[in-house]
Each structure stands twice: as structure tokens, then as C-alpha cells.
Amino acid sequence: MNGSEYFVKIQSFLGGAPTEDLKALSQQNVSMDLATFMKLRTDAVLPLTVAEVQKLLGPHVEGLKAEERHRPVRDWILRQRQDDLDTLGLGLQGGIPNGYLVLDLSMQEALSGTPCLLGP
């Protein structure tokens, strides 16, 4: 069974998938469509890297642009370095500016909903 066939079988169960499962899926050429991606748990999507999301979506990655202001895409963009987002060539905006450090302060992030940044 190839990646696409596998994805069709599990598609309806993906809404509650944890980050680990999404990372694993990204290695299987599933080409997840944006409608499915938008239904994923925000907390499961946030830890994914730009490279992992690109692999997870395959050719559908260009659809991120149309949904860049909808969750979970919006929240995911806010967690990525702008340099990394730029590699997609989609014109995505709102990433962490170059030269900033991301501090993983769980309490700070839980309160504010955004990562804590330290300027250069």
C-alpha cells in the first residue's frame, strides 16, 4: 500500500492525531490535503518544522498561503523562523524575525499564546 492509499484509510481518524504521528506521516509521502490539515489539533501541529509540514502536505503545501490567517496554520507560522518559511516560496508572513531567539518558556507561552522572543 502506497502513502496515498494509506492516507485515505486513516484520514477520518487524523483529527486527534498527536505530533509524533504527524511526524511519522510526514515520512510516508501521504500528501495530506489542506482540508484535513486544518482539522488537526493545533497543539499537535505547532511542534512540526517547516520541512516536516512540507513533506506532510507534499504538493498541497502551496495551500498554506490561502489559509495563513486561519488556525492552525496561523499559529504554526508564528512559531517558525521567517527564514525557514521563506524557503517555501509562498510569501508566508508572520514568522520569527531573523536573529531572534525563541525561549521555550511553557508558562509564558500558556499565558500569552505566543512564544517568548529575545531580540538580537
Epitope: 489542506l34 482540508a35 486544518m38 482539522k39 502551496e62 495551500g63 498561503k65 489559509e67 486561519h70 509562498l90
Partner: antibody, heavy 119, light 108 residues
Framework: EVQLVQSGAEVKKPGASVKVSCKAS????????MDWVRQAPGQGLEWMGD????????IYNQKFSGRVTMTEDKSASTVYMELSSLRSEDTAVYYC????????????WGQGTTVTVSS | EIVLTQSPATLSLSPGERATLSCSAS???????LSWYQQKPGQSPRLLIY???NLASGIPARFSGSGSGTDYTLTISSLEPEDFAVYYC?????????FGGGTKVEIK
């Protein structure tokens, strides 16, 4: 057949609110966002915002922020657009338009709802 | 916001002639994020072209689109009677999404 059927024409007084419905049929409702676009008499098209029927997430054009609210009823495959604090310049035809999630173009449009704001 | 300026505002042509409609953006637009719509009097808009040059379903091949950056063009190779209408360009490269003011193609 894919169809978007909108509610009928409305006449409202300045300061009032209007709620327009858009019932979708012929496709998987949650695979498409629904956008709202308006057209004042003899004028061009103006994008108002959109709603993702799957999540209920909304994005509004800042021009309408605070006055527009978009909602959905998945069980009825229907989206709603409510515009408050109406003024005469809100007189327009309001269209719902289907947009496949992950794209930015509108491939199916409703027939339009005429909203007239007059004292 | 990106302002889309369409020219000319009105194009007077005869059936069989070639129509060239322009759409100029105030800032660069990624070509995948530009589309064209046709609207006839009393009707809803209809998608003609998406991603600058892709024909929407059911649209005849006499319609074509091209362009990049800030300049985009819709061409109708040979006007048919049903092509006389208003045409709008639309961008979703930058928020908020915007439409051009329209070009009316009328019978000369």
C-alpha cells in the same frame, strides 16, 4: 449539482442589522471555505471575509471588523453573514462564494442577496 | 492593501476582434495568487482563470491569462457575443484580498 442558495432581499433602516444566509448543496460542505463578497450599485467587488465551516474559524477584512460576523450550521450546510450598524453605503448585493480550502479563488457563487439601507 | 488597477475602464470592440485587458498591482503579486472573473448584468461573477493562466472548468480556450509581478493580462482571442461583460482581476497574495475596479467589454 453544486449550488449556493442565498436568502431573499432585505430592506433595513440605518443602525439596524441584517443576517444573510447561504445554503450549500451538492458537495462536501467542510472541504470548502465560504467567503462573502459585496457589490455596491454600479461598483466593483469587495471581499468581506470568510469562514471555515469545519472549524468555525473566521477571517474578516479589517474594514468590516467589529460589524461583521460569519457563522455556520454544519447540520444544515448553511453559513450566515451578519452585518450590524448598517449605513446607507452598505446598500449592495451580498454574495457568498465557495473557496476550496487551500486555494484563494471562488469557483461557485450564490445568486446574491440585495440589501437596501434606507431611512 | 494591494490596489488592483484595471485598464481600460471600457473596451469597445466588435465580435471576432481580440480583447486585451490589463490589471496592474500596486505591489508585486505572486502569480499563483491572481485570478479573473466575468460578470454579466444581473448575474453573479463567474470564475474564468485562476493562478494567472489556468482556465476554470467549462471556460472556452479563447480566454487566456498571463503576467507576473505587478502586471497581468487577460486576453480574449476572438470575441463572441456572449463575451460582452465586465471582467475583474482578483489577488489573494496579500491581505486583505482585493479586486480590480473592472473592465467593461462592450459592443462597438
Amino acid at each position: 449539482e453544486v449550488q449556493l442558495v442565498q436568502s431573499g432581499a432585505e430592506v433595513k433602516k440605518p443602525g439596524a442589522s441584517v443576517k444573510v444566509s447561504c445554503k450549500a448543496s451538492g458537495y462536501t460542505f467542510t472541504d470548502y471555505n465560504m467567503d462573502w463578497v459585496r457589490q455596491a450599485p454600479g461598483q466593483g467587488l469587495e471581499w468581506m471575509g470568510d469562514i471555515n465551516p469545519s472549524t468555525g474559524g473566521t477571517i474578516y477584512n479589517q474594514k468590516f471588523s467589529g460589524r461583521v460576523t460569519m457563522t455556520e450550521d454544519k447540520s444544515a450546510s448553511t453559513v450566515y453573514m451578519e452585518l450590524s450598524s448598517l449605513r446607507s453605503e452598505d446598500t449592495a448585493v451580498y454574495y457568498c462564494a465557495r473557496r476550496r480550502i487551500g486555494t484563494g479563488y471562488f469557483d461557485v457563487w450564490g445568486q446574491g442577496t440585495t440589501v437596501t439601507v434606507s431611512s | 492593501e494591494i490596489v488592483l488597477t484595471q485598464s481600460p475602464a471600457t473596451l469597445s470592440l466588435s465580435p471576432g476582434e481580440r480583447a486585451t485587458l490589463s490589471c496592474s498591482a500596486s505591489s508585486s503579486v505572486i502569480s499563483s495568487y491572481l485570478s479573473w472573473y466575468q460578470q454579466k448584468p444581473g448575474q453573479s461573477p463567474r470564475l474564468l482563470i485562476y493562478r494567472t493562466s489556468n482556465l476554470a472548468s467549462g471556460i472556452p480556450a479563447r480566454f487566456s491569462g498571463s503576467g507576473s509581478g505587478t502586471d497581468y493580462t487577460l486576453t480574449i482571442s476572438s470575441l463572441e457575443p456572449e463575451d460582452f461583460a465586465v471582467y475583474y482581476c482578483h489577488q489573494w497574495s496579500s491581505f486583505p484580498y482585493t479586486f480590480g475596479g473592472g473592465t467593461k467589454v462592450e459592443i462597438k
